[in-house]
């Protein structure tokens, strides 16, 4: 209960702070619990204590280790453990995922991103910010403090964010980066009774013997991906795998997201080479979700050839 | 948030009925269907049917046909699920769950014991 | 109905693995899958929506792959949470189907 992971890059401040807390004034021993051997308070040393924290400037690779801490008072002794693990850095841009804090989630309505431990170390603004290792740029993204701010949150915001800062410690400076996982967490997401967009109903098609037809059948059903949405076509009140007709197929179109964020979707009937009694069937346009089914249907004509006679 | 929050658990005889409800908060009641799903006891998950909340369409599993009915109260965010002719192995852990980008919001769940 | 079938049914696994669940559909259901965590005593979780979306607050050491009738959730390094039941639930098609689950223990 009373240890804490902590971890950092070698090369990089790192500070960690006690996970037993105690008033100021309660002296704190730090230990390399390894070798029971005290932590020094000098601040000229590269690892040293400084009350509750203790602080790596930088840190090493060896420095990795179980750290115990003892909050001293007048009354009792309180023991806690930092289990520090320092990594070398990567090379390439992916961040593993022992390097990772913990995922944080934002909305259209709170897009915030908190510098994981920030507030352990002396740092001076600006914070730089980095999302899936490129500098942020543009005016959606705003350093704000201790956070960064996306404007106009959309899904493709999810990613690694890794914030940079410099923490300065009697006028030396170090560098400290810190990622964490951003998802977007849609709280419009809703669903509709089904709305078919195409085709209109009762819509007459004109199409001419011997050649090709498509109609499309198109369809939303609220915001955000659906569960259990569907659009299709029925002949005659059958579905087309059951019609037994190959010239007629169905193929699914593309899922739409158009720009004011309703799921679509689109089915498109393939007529090879319109026969005269293709004109006789009924052609059904089928949406439906966990609301219930919308039907349009549709009926085919010909098309009148040009007169050119007249 | 949305937040569903399930009736406590029953204890039932052999042919009689339960009725276990379901109270929504957060979010739009009518912009969701809500799903039952049961685990009887070291089982996984089976699917039992559907409800809209926007016009009370539902959808029963063909297993629970004629046995179950799903109704919901919109005034007060609160759908129900009874299941009737109850049987031993109707014994399981109920839970309703949000269902419109996935089944992204459970109920806690609640124990119907079916035993003579 | 379209059955899921999961395997493994069970694993062993220490902290630090990679852990790989597989869930094969009786056809074809496009993006329509689904993963859910379930700790005992407790409600299931969504995971991991339309095959690869991290739910709210999911570590991203979670995550989906797959298409049609084959899909995996992989779980990057195992932490001690990771220990539960994790199900994949397809719903392309009406009734929605759960694969049996895979429970993953502490070797």
């Known amino acids: 209960k009373f240890s804490k992971q902590s971890w950092g890059l070698e090369n990089e401040a790192l500070i960690v702070r006690c996970p037993r807390q105690g008033k100021p004034s309660y002296t704190v021993d730090w230990y390399y619990s390894q070798t029971n051997k005290s932590i020094p308070t000098q601040e000229r040393n590269r690892v040293f204590a400084s009350g509750q924290l203790l602080k790596f400037l930088p840190a090493a690779v060896a420095d990795s280790g179980i750290y115990t801490c003892i909050v001293r008072s007048p009354t009792f002794n309180r023991t806690g453990y930092a289990n520090v693990t320092i990594y070398k850095k990567q090379s390439d841009c992916n961040v593993p995922d022992y390097l990772m804090y913990s995922t944080v989630s934002g909305s259209e309505k709170n897009s915030k991103i908190y510098c994981p431990t920030i507030d352990l170390y002396n740092w001076t603004a600006p914070l730089e910010w980095f999302k899936n290792c490129q500098a942020l740029q543009g005016s959606r993204y705003r350093a704000h403090k201790s956070f960064l701010v996306i404007d106009n949150v959309m899904t493709e915001d999810a990613g690694d964010y890794t914030c940079k800062f410099i923490h300065n410690e009697n006028g030396a400076n170090y560098s400290v980066t810190a990622t964490r996982s951003f998802t977007v967490k849609d709280e419009q997401g809703f669903s509709l009774f089904p709305v078919i967009g195409a085709p209109a109903q009762n819509e007459i098609k004109e199409v001419e013997i011997g050649k090709n037809a498509n109609l499309t059948c198109s369809a939303c059903f609220g915001k955000g991906t659906q569960f259990l949405a569907a659009v299709l076509w029925q002949l005659n009140g059958t579905k087309i795998t059951d019609f037994g007709e190959p010239r007629i197929q169905q193929e699914e179109g593309q899922n739409q997201s158009f720009s004011n964020g309703l799921a679509c979707l689109d089915m498109v009937l393939r007529i090879a080479d319109v026969k005269e009694e293709d004109l006789l069937l009924q052609y059904d346009c089928l949406a439906l979700n966990l609301h219930g089914l919308r039907r349009h249907t549709v009926r085919l004509s010909r098309k009148n050839p040009i007169d050119h006679h007249s | 948030q949305v937040q569903l929050v399930q009736s406590g658990a029953e204890v039932k005889k052999p042919g009689s009925s339960v009725k276990v409800s379901c109270k929504a908060s957060?979010?739009?009641?009518?912009?969701?269907?809500i799903s039952w799903v049961r685990q009887a006891p070291g089982q996984g998950l089976e699917w039992m049917g559907w409800i809209s909340a926007y016009n009370g369409n539902t959808n029963y599993a063909q297993k629970f046909q004629g046995r179950v009915t799903m109704t919901r109260d919109t005034s007060t965010s609160t759908v129900y699920m009874e299941l009737s002719s109850l049987r031993s192995e109707d014994t399981a852990v109920y839970y309703c769950?949000?269902?419109?980008?996935?089944?992204?919001?459970w109920g806690q769940g609640t124990l119907v014991t079916v035993s003579s | 109905d379209i059955q899921m079938t999961q395997s493994p049914s069970s694993l062993s696994a220490s902290v630090g693995d990679r852990v790989t669940i597989t869930c094969r559909a009786s056809q074809g259901i496009r993006s329509n899958l689904d993963w859910y965590q379930q700790k005992p005593g407790k409600a299931p979780k969504l995971l991991i929506s339309?095959?690869?979306n991290l739910g709210s607050g999911v570590p991203s050491r979670f995550s989906g792959s797959g298409s049609g009738t084959d899909f995996t959730l992989t779980i990057s390094s195992l932490q001690p949470e990771d220990f539960a039941t994790y199900y994949c639930?397809?719903?392309?098609?009406?009734?929605?189907?759960f694969g049996g689950g895979t429970k993953v223990e502490i070797k």
């Open positions: 769950a949000r269902s419109t980008n996935a089944l992204d919001y």
């Open positions: 639930l397809q719903h392309n098609s009406n009734p929605p189907t």
């Open positions: 339309i095959v690869s």
């Open positions: 957060g979010g739009t009641f009518s912009n969701y269907a």
